[in-house]
């Protein structure tokens, strides 16, 4: 058993049929010595008396809010949560496996630049009685500070018969140098509590590996005389690290119709303009990627050919 | 046809071309190592990230873009002295800071060159003959060092009398290549920045 926060405790259980469970001793936070009784949740049934209560925790029915009273007055609470371990593996029932970039990916994180700010998100099908708490650091043995905000519900989607909820959190490394060469990864730890179930999820990464620039901005087309060719120009996204001559981007320019199966014109360039062939009912799209360290491409910025 | 875009003449800054070749060569070598040594811990997640130049050079700090010198997190107070006669830029343009930066890059390259050559000598003794360093990568390091044209003492190649542990050598190769790739990215950014300046 360990303390998650004040008056909230996590009991780690090996989860298999007829498991013996864990013996837990609760102590009432009071100077009183006698006349103390214990109850669980909203029940008035007295579970025991005395300053301490010893219980055998085997299943979710044994978890919950234990309260010690004296003469009708509440003295203190202890909330017990369960953390299940099945076949030596901690349960991951609360969050959905995003399977990208690999299986068992519950947390996904992205950064728009090298400033040390990043966003992580996760998915669940659970809609109520759900809380998250996020901590982060640079390195684990001698951790350096990363400050994370509160996790918030950022999107809801319908997936077949199920509703899916996306939560996200923004974090900022306390003293980040955009030009630094990272040798210690960022660690992100998410505590998830659903009703009386506790789970924790972690992710470890270098900012350089989670970079995904915003799409290029201000796409403009200039038709070339006596030609089907157009010159397309754009600018670096505002959120990208500066100076741009140091943090350079490379671009992919594509002309394509509405369907992905349609024919296309595609060219890669380090410049902020390119010449392509425009077709009726097609769109010109441009996306960006760090020129020197190939992490993710940005989403496309598009303008219609016409 | 692409319309002309105002870009600096690459002749002004010969090191830019060499640094691009360097990043390409080390990236290819790292990819080859990851494929060949697939049963060794050779991915970014599996290895320890060590920097053999730590406390010996200060390339990131010495080559910091002016715009980032206002960022206190970027200013590490590591004092290192360097030789200042680089030839990558015409001498009239070579400020003291730039010479410091280029000589720091030169020292990085020299250190990695020695490590890679020592390691290759060990790998050549491996009866499995599983992996060797790409001669192209070694040549590209050499070309960039020549373009930087700094005079400094030659570092003797480390020789070891004991039997090499090939497993450890291959793991060290992965660690070195990962670190060198990160440094090559910094070098490329620096050259691009100097070229634009």
């Amino acid at each position: 058993i360990w303390e998650l926060k004040k008056d909230v405790y996590v009991v780690e259980l090996d989860w298999y049929p007829d498991a013996p469970g864990e013996m837990v001793v609760l102590t009432c936070d009071t100077p009183e010595e006698d006349g103390i009784t214990w109850t669980l949740d909203q029940s008035s049934e007295v579970l025991g008396s005395g300053k301490t209560l010893t219980i055998q925790v085997k299943e979710f029915g044994d978890a919950g809010q234990y309260t010690c009273h004296k003469g009708g007055e509440v003295l203190s609470h202890s909330l017990l949560l369960l953390h299940k371990k099945e076949d030596g593996i901690w349960s991951t029932d609360i969050l959905k496996d995003q399977k990208e970039p690999k299986n068992k990916t519950f947390l996904r994180c992205e950064a728009k630049n090298y400033s040390g700010r990043f966003t992580c998100w996760w998915l669940t099908t659970i809609s109520t009685d759900l809380t998250f708490s996020v901590k982060s650091s640079r390195g684990s043995s001698d951790p350096q500070g990363v400050t994370c905000g509160a996790a918030t519900l950022s999107a809801e989607r319908v997936r077949g018969d199920n509703k899916e909820y996306e939560y996200s959190v923004e974090c900022q490394e306390d003293s980040a140098c955009p030009a630094a060469e990272e040798s210690l990864p960022i660690e992100v730890m998410v505590d998830a509590v659903h009703k009386l179930k506790y789970e924790n999820y972690t992710s470890s990464f270098f900012i350089r590996d989670i970079i995904k620039p915003d799409p290029p901005k201000n796409l403009q087309l200039k038709p070339l005389k006596n030609s089907r060719q157009v010159e397309v120009s754009w600018e670096y996204p505002d959120t990208w690290s500066t100076p741009h001559s140091y943090f350079s981007l490379t671009f992919c320019v594509q002309v394509q119709g509405k369907s992905k199966r349609e024919k296309k014109d595609r060219v890669f360039t380090d410049k902020t303009s390119a010449t392509v062939i425009c077709r009726k009912n097609a769109s010109i799209s441009v996306r960006a990627q760090d020129r020197y360290y190939s992490s993710s491409w940005s989403e496309w910025a598009s303008v219609p050919c016409s | 046809r692409n319309l002309p875009v105002a870009t600096p003449d690459p002749g002004m800054f010969p090191c830019l071309h060499h640094s691009q070749n360097l990043l390409r060569a080390v990236s290819n070598m790292l990819q080859k190592a990851r494929q060949t040594l697939e049963f060794y811990p050779c991915t970014s997640e599996e290895i320890d990230h060590e920097d053999i130049t730590k406390d010996k050079t200060s390339t990131v700090e010495a080559c910091l873009p002016l715009e980032l010198t206002k960022n206190e997190s970027c200013l590490n107070s590591r004092e290192t002295s360097f030789i200042t006669n680089g030839s990558c830029l015409a001498s009239r343009k070579t400020s003291f800071m730039m010479a410091l930066c280029l000589s720091s890059i030169y020292e990085d390259l020299k250190m990695y060159q020695v490590e890679f050559k020592t390691m290759n000598a060990k790998l050549l003794m491996d009866p499995k003959r599983q992996i060797f360093l790409d001669q192209n990568m070694l040549a590209v390091i050499d070309e960039l060092m020549q373009a930087l044209n700094f005079n400094s003492e030659t570092v003797p190649q480390k020789s070891s009398l004991e039997e090499p542990d090939f497993y450890k050598t291959k793991i060290k190769l992965c660690i070195l290549l990962h670190a060198f790739r990160i440094r090559a990215v910094t070098i490329d950014r620096v050259m691009s920045y100097l070229n634009a300046s």
Partner: antibody
Framework: QVQLVQSGAEVKKPGSSVKVSCKAS????????LHWVRQAPGQGLEWMGW????????EYAPKFQGRVTITADESTSTAYMELSSLRSEDTAVYYC???????????WGQGTLVTVSS | DIVMTQSPLSLPVTPGEPASISCRAS??????LHWYQQKPGQAARLLIA???QSISGVPSRFSGSGSGTDFTLTISSLQPEDFATYYC?????????FGQGTKVEIK
């Protein structure tokens, strides 16, 4: 299986014209860009131009501008390349080729040898 | 027009050994570079698109690298069926242009 079948070999006199055909099968004809590339005996590949069969748009290499005409007939899934004012150095194997990507080629015809000789 | 220069023009290789072909562009072309294989009397076959993207159906022993002006096609271990002429082609701008070809022959 995408296939491009070209017309047979031709022998032409200098100053005359030649029209080579290329019939496509497999896939929708207008879903691909069609290119013409030639190869003189013992020489390398030389791009001549492309056509978008969907709208008839064409682009020619400056070297052939004014001498080459590429056309396409959607109803028969056939493309044509006509080269006029032939000279001996136009002796080559002419390939039609196609791709959904405009700027490179993934399927080639078997080639048509055009010999220009007096 | 962008001029593509291949080297060497002839490359004698022992079967089973690796081979590398170089292609240089007269100006920077990013990764707009493609590689083809051509056997005598046959049409060309696409091997690599955009400098390093592998093409389905092409054996994994063929790989490409490079960007800007310098590109390399590598065959990790030459098989008897790989003896052919190899061409690079730039797609950065029209007209599309090819290298003059590299003939890989049995040593």
């Amino acid at each position: 299986q995408v296939q491009l079948v070209q017309s047979g070999a031709e022998v032409k006199k200098p100053g005359s014209s030649v029209k080579v055909s290329c019939k496509a099968s497999g896939g929708t004809f207008s879903d691909y860009y069609l290119h013409w590339v030639r190869q003189a005996p013992g020489q390398g590949l030389e791009w001549m131009g492309w056509i978008d069969p969907e709208n008839g748009d064409t682009e020619y290499a400056p070297k052939f501008q004014g001498r080459v005409t590429i056309t396409a007939d959607e109803s028969t899934s056939t493309a044509y390349m006509e080269l006029s004012s032939l000279r001996s150095e136009d002796t080559a194997v002419y390939y039609c080729a196609r791709n959904k990507e405009l700027r490179y080629i993934d399927v080639w015809g078997q080639g048509t040898l055009v010999t220009v000789s007096s | 027009d962008i001029v593509m220069t291949q080297s060497p023009l002839s490359l004698p290789v022992t079967p089973g050994e690796p081979a590398s072909i170089s292609c240089r562009a007269s100006q920077s072309i990013s990764i707009n570079l493609h590689w083809y294989q051509q056997k005598p009397g046959q049409a060309a076959r696409l091997l690599i698109a955009f400098a390093s993207q592998s093409i389905s159906g092409v054996p994994s022993r063929f790989s490409g690298s490079g960007s800007g002006t310098d590109f390399t096609l590598t065959i990790s271990s030459l098989q008897p069926e790989d003896f052919a002429t190899y061409y690079c082609q730039q797609s950065n701008s029209f007209p599309l242009t090819f290298g003059q070809g590299t003939k890989v022959e049995i040593k």
